[in-house]
């Protein structure tokens, strides 16, 4: 069922990272608009991005009230104009998009080094906690906030002579390790949560070596 | 609301194992980690291992390891803990829990009933 | 494996405030611990007053808090009432484990 001269949206897609969460679909809109719902799957309906000529939806206000609910949103199609306008079941034309949990399923955005350290033969490095769209008592939760203890990161470092990398895991957001005195070391971290099915792993930070600005180097 | 039910008291043999289930409700059930923890009687808590619904991954207590598995139903929501190559000194009641998760926060809130398992010839 | 210490037994007048506390043998008790404080009273079963090192669940009430005090995990009771008499347990998370500690019997006298 559904109205003269729409078309379904198609290829419903959820686009997430850190929680920042966009739902995108098909096609580019031809005389027709569109409007979105999204609702837990115990929850009422809500909508969003009323009659836009759209093919995407910012829904993070929405998915960031429960992270760890599951969501489902739909996309309803309208002509262009008589909006009020519906298909034969008395209903719009509308799409269901996948199942979205976004606890289990957002991206890990790409890490920073914040900062390293030097001190004789030790090197701390530091990961930048990354502020989420997650609120608590009106104040954003970083990423450890919200993960908490299944989130870990890797460090890669290699000396800047050589091309053998190492590793080290924490489960804070610093790593201490050891490096050859007088040789210089670049770094590289991902974000990791081990216990999921999917998007496991963040992209590489950015390299950072020793030398450069970001660290310090205090020789005892 | 949330809700952790544990399934009946057990009597088992020496070198039996016993499947002890954990069936949720009132919230999301792949989100959150499943702890199980024991009690032998007179005793403190003691930590067995977790499992987390979603992808059913799995951490156990290095003691338990290779006697214990920890497995779920999603059809269902519910948990499972079962201990093979029972002893008398596994007699306890076994405690299923659920984490208080608001924005953060990461231990043992919700718990079941409990489960007396008992282990004699 | 790691051992969690608690005191094994404290007491605290009606109305007094008392600190349990929980060490590491290796180490300082940080927030990456993730601190959880459990409550048991004789013939029942546990209950959580406190996870994550300091967030109350909605069911404990605001005489106890939970904190970090220099290398230690702290539960402070204020005003303690007779039905705080009970077994508390502390439990911190070692990188892939929880460890309990062996608990610290409360009296209230």
């Known amino acids: 069922s559904g109205t003269t001269n729409t078309v379904a949206a198609y290829n419903l897609t959820w686009k997430s990272t850190n929680f920042k969460t966009i739902l995108e679909w098909e096609p580019k809109p031809v005389n027709q608009v569109y409007t979105v719902q999204i609702s837990t799957k115990s929850g009422d309906w809500k909508s969003k991005c009323f009659y836009t000529t759209d093919t995407e939806c910012d829904l993070t206000d929405e998915i960031v009230k429960d992270v760890k609910q599951t969501y489902l949103a739909r996309v309803f199609s309208y002509p262009a104009g008589n909006v009020e306008s519906t298909g034969s079941a008395g209903e719009p034309l509308y799409e269901n998009s996948p199942e979205f949990t976004p606890y289990l399923e957002t991206n890990l955005g790409q890490p920073t080094i914040q900062s390293f350290e030097q001190v004789g033969t030790k090197v701390n490095v530091t990961v930048e906690d990354e502020r989420t769209l997650v609120r608590r008592n009106n104040t954003f939760l970083s990423l450890r906030d919200v993960f908490g203890k299944d989130l870990i990161y890797t460090l890669y470092y290699w000396k800047s002579s050589s091309s053998g990398k190492k590793t080290a895991k924490t489960n804070t957001n610093e790593f201490l390790i050891d490096v050859d005195k007088g040789e210089n070391y670049c770094f590289s971290v991902q974000a990791v949560i081990p216990s999921r099915t999917v998007n496991r792993k963040s992209t590489d930070s950015p390299v950072e070596c020793m030398g450069q600005e970001k660290g310090e180097f205090r020789e005892i | 609301q949330v809700q952790l039910q544990e399934s009946g008291a057990e009597v088992k043999k020496p070198g039996a194992s016993v499947k002890v289930s954990c069936k949720a409700s009132?919230?999301?059930?792949?989100?959150?980690?499943i702890e199980w923890v024991r009690q032998a009687p007179g005793q403190g808590l003691e930590w067995m291992g977790e499992?987390?619904?979603?992808?059913?991954?799995?951490k156990y207590n290095e003691k338990f390891k290779g006697r214990v598995t920890m497995t779920r139903d999603t059809s269902t929501s519910t948990v499972y803990m079962e201990l093979s190559s029972l002893r008398s000194e596994d007699t306890a009641v076994y405690y299923c829990?659920?984490?208080?998760?608001?924005?953060?926060?990461?231990?043992?809130?919700?718990w079941g009933q409990g489960t007396l398992v008992t282990v004699s010839s | 494996q790691a051992v969690v210490t608690q005191e094994p037994s404290l007491t605290v007048s009606p109305g007094g405030s008392v600190t349990l506390t929980c060490r590491s043998s290796?180490?300082?008790?940080?927030?990456?611990?993730?601190a959880n404080w459990i409550q048991q009273k004789p013939g029942q079963g546990p209950k959580t007053l406190i996870s994550?090192?300091?967030n109350r669940g909605p069911w404990t009430t605001a005489r106890f808090s939970g904190s970090i005090l220099g290398d230690k995990a702290v539960l402070t009771l204020w005003g303690a009432h007779a039905e705080d008499e009970a077994d508390y347990y502390c439990?911190?998370?070692?990188?892939?484990?929880?460890?309990f500690g062996g608990g610290t019997h409360l009296t209230v006298q």
């Open positions: 829990a659920r984490d208080y998760y608001y924005g953060s926060s990461y231990g043992f809130a919700y």
């Open positions: 009132g919230y999301t059930f792949s989100s959150y980690w």
């Open positions: 499992i987390l619904p979603g992808s059913a991954s799995t």
């Open positions: 290796t180490g300082a008790v940080t927030t990456s611990n993730y």
């Open positions: 994550g090192t300091n």
């Open positions: 439990a911190l998370w070692y990188s892939n484990h929880w460890v």
